[in-house]
């Protein structure tokens, strides 16, 4: 940038130094040099001399015209060719920027991670603006009508200490830059409904040496929330498809979940929880990899054909992952949900 250039004249931009990308732009240079009647006035963009679309308006002033200017940033300066001077003489310079007005922020979400002491709000900013864009988060109590505002760049963490006067709020985000302003839709927030339980962690897993080997996965959380609903997803490391089991959990003790898995296979497990009946999930836990032991009997055990866990797990679904190399980033793409029934000798192979 050239914020502190000493000008011997003036430079100005129409429609302005920050303008909408793709607009036609005129940049004017007016010299006020002592002891110089310039033969020529030259324009430079990012240090390179411009050759085209330059008009000499009068003895002191010239203009350069750009059709559909689409560079996000450029440094313009102009010089004079003074008789008797070997070098060109600097007249003035300007930083110019082009960009877009902001889109209305979308998908506004606010959550309180248990024990964090903050309400974290995130949103989609939309297409890139290429210019400095700020976001003003408005938090208005529905009980006291008081409004707080927070400046942010992409997300905001608001201390729950500053949300003491009320439980119900209206939250919205205002996107502001030099070219415009847009508001998100308003989000109704009840502080008791947006708590995400403290992180769930898979601590260990073991496979028993029984005739029908079973794998027990141990998992825990430091949450103080009594009613928690969890999902555990698992698959072999070579597979693209996740199986998902659901549990009602009580974290006053370590959870144990039993699985009947293929022998001699490497499995990856992940768990996530939410407060029962609420909509915000934890992120999936770090992948936990477990190798099942080699088969002792002759039966090739199908993972779907055996009794399910002792807990309230009822639903198993299959979910296809985007990439087997990044288990943490896998998304639910399609789910075929089916109920598990206790096995009673008549093994079902479910596809």
């Amino acid at each position: 940038g050239i914020t502190s250039i000493n000008c011997s004249g003036d430079m100005w931009v129409e429609p302005g130094e920050i303008f909408q990308m793709g607009m036609n732009v005129s940049i004017y240079c007016q010299e006020a040099l002592k002891h110089c009647r310039p033969r020529n006035l030259y324009f430079y963009k990012n240090g390179f001399k411009e050759e085209f679309d330059i008009t000499r308006i009068n003895r002191t002033t010239a203009r350069i015209w750009y059709k559909g200017f689409s560079e996000p940033h450029a440094y313009m300066h102009c010089t004079a060719e003074c008789p008797g001077h070997f070098q060109e003489t600097l007249i003035c310079g300007k930083d110019i920027s082009s960009g877009h007005p902001p889109d209305a922020p979308s998908n506004l979400t606010c959550v309180i991670y248990e024990y964090s002491g903050n309400m974290t709000c995130t949103w989609n900013t939309g297409k890139p603006t290429y210019i400095d864009t700020k976001y003003i988060v408005h938090v208005k109590s529905l009980e006291t009508e008081e409004e707080q505002q927070y400046l942010a760049s992409s997300y905001v963490k608001i201390s729950t200490d500053s949300l003491q006067g009320s439980r119900k709020y209206l939250v919205w985000v205002q996107a502001v830059n030099s070219l415009g302003m847009e508001n998100s839709q308003q989000l109704h927030v009840h502080l008791d409904d947006i708590v995400i339980p403290s992180a769930s962690i898979i601590s260990r897993a073991e496979t028993t040496n029984d005739t029908v080997p079973k794998t027990i996965v141990y998992w825990k959380s430091k949450t103080m929330i009594e009613k928690v609903f969890c999902e555990m997803r698992y698959k072999t490391t070579t597979n693209q498809t996740w199986s998902v089991k659901e549990f009602d959990a009580n974290f006053t003790y370590v959870q144990q979940s039993e699985f009947y898995l293929e022998p001699d296979s490497k499995y990856v497990f992940q768990v996530r929880c939410q407060e029962t009946g609420k909509r915000n999930w934890q992120p999936w836990s770090s992948p936990f990899v477990h190798q099942t032991s080699q088969e002792t009997g002759k039966r090739n055990w199908q993972p779907w054909s055996s009794p399910f866990v002792h807990q309230t797990s009822q639903t198993v679904s299959q979910v296809t992952a985007k990439s087997s190399h990044e288990p943490q980033k896998m998304e639910m793409l399609s789910a075929t949900i089916f109920r598990g029934h206790p096995a009673s000798g008549n093994h079902q192979d479910i596809g």
Partner: nanobody
Framework: QVQLQESGGGLVQPGGSLRLSCAAS????????MRWVRQAPGKGLEWVSG???????IYADSVKGRFTISKDNAKNTLYLQLNSLKSEDTAMYYC??????????GSQGTQVTVSS
């Protein structure tokens, strides 16, 4: 009730500096975002700068790099430091609640005149 009292304006030469103050009462200042707006002679209100309760700031392009907004929660006072003043900064300056917007709530304002 909410009260805001601006001060610190005056006559200054181009390139000079001033510090404006806004004394606030009648609300929880430390939790409140604030802004400065101005009105040049014969023109409409123009938003200048804003600050939230945590000290994050935002500026109009016309003053970026020259003006600095700040707040002192212990003194319930909002400030605007004006440097490298230009003739086009001549205006009545007002403070208001909220980080952004070209309105104010009827405080008296303080006059800044930049002239040689």
């Amino acid at each position: 009730q909410v009260q805001l009292q601006e001060s610190g304006g005056g006559l200054v030469q181009p390139g000079g500096s001033l510090r404006l103050s806004c004394a606030a009462s009648g609300f929880t200042f430390r939790l409140t975002a604030m802004r400065w707006v101005r009105q040049a002679p014969g023109k409409g209100l123009e938003w200048v700068s804003g600050i939230d309760s945590r000290g994050s700031t935002i500026y109009a392009d016309s003053v970026k790099g020259r003006f600095t907004i700040s707040k002192d929660n212990a003194k319930n006072t909002l400030y605007l430091q004006l440097n490298s003043l230009k003739s086009e900064d001549t205006a009545m300056y007002y403070c208001a609640q909220g980080v952004y917007g070209d309105t104010y709530s009827g405080s008296q304002g303080t006059q800044v005149t930049v002239s040689s």
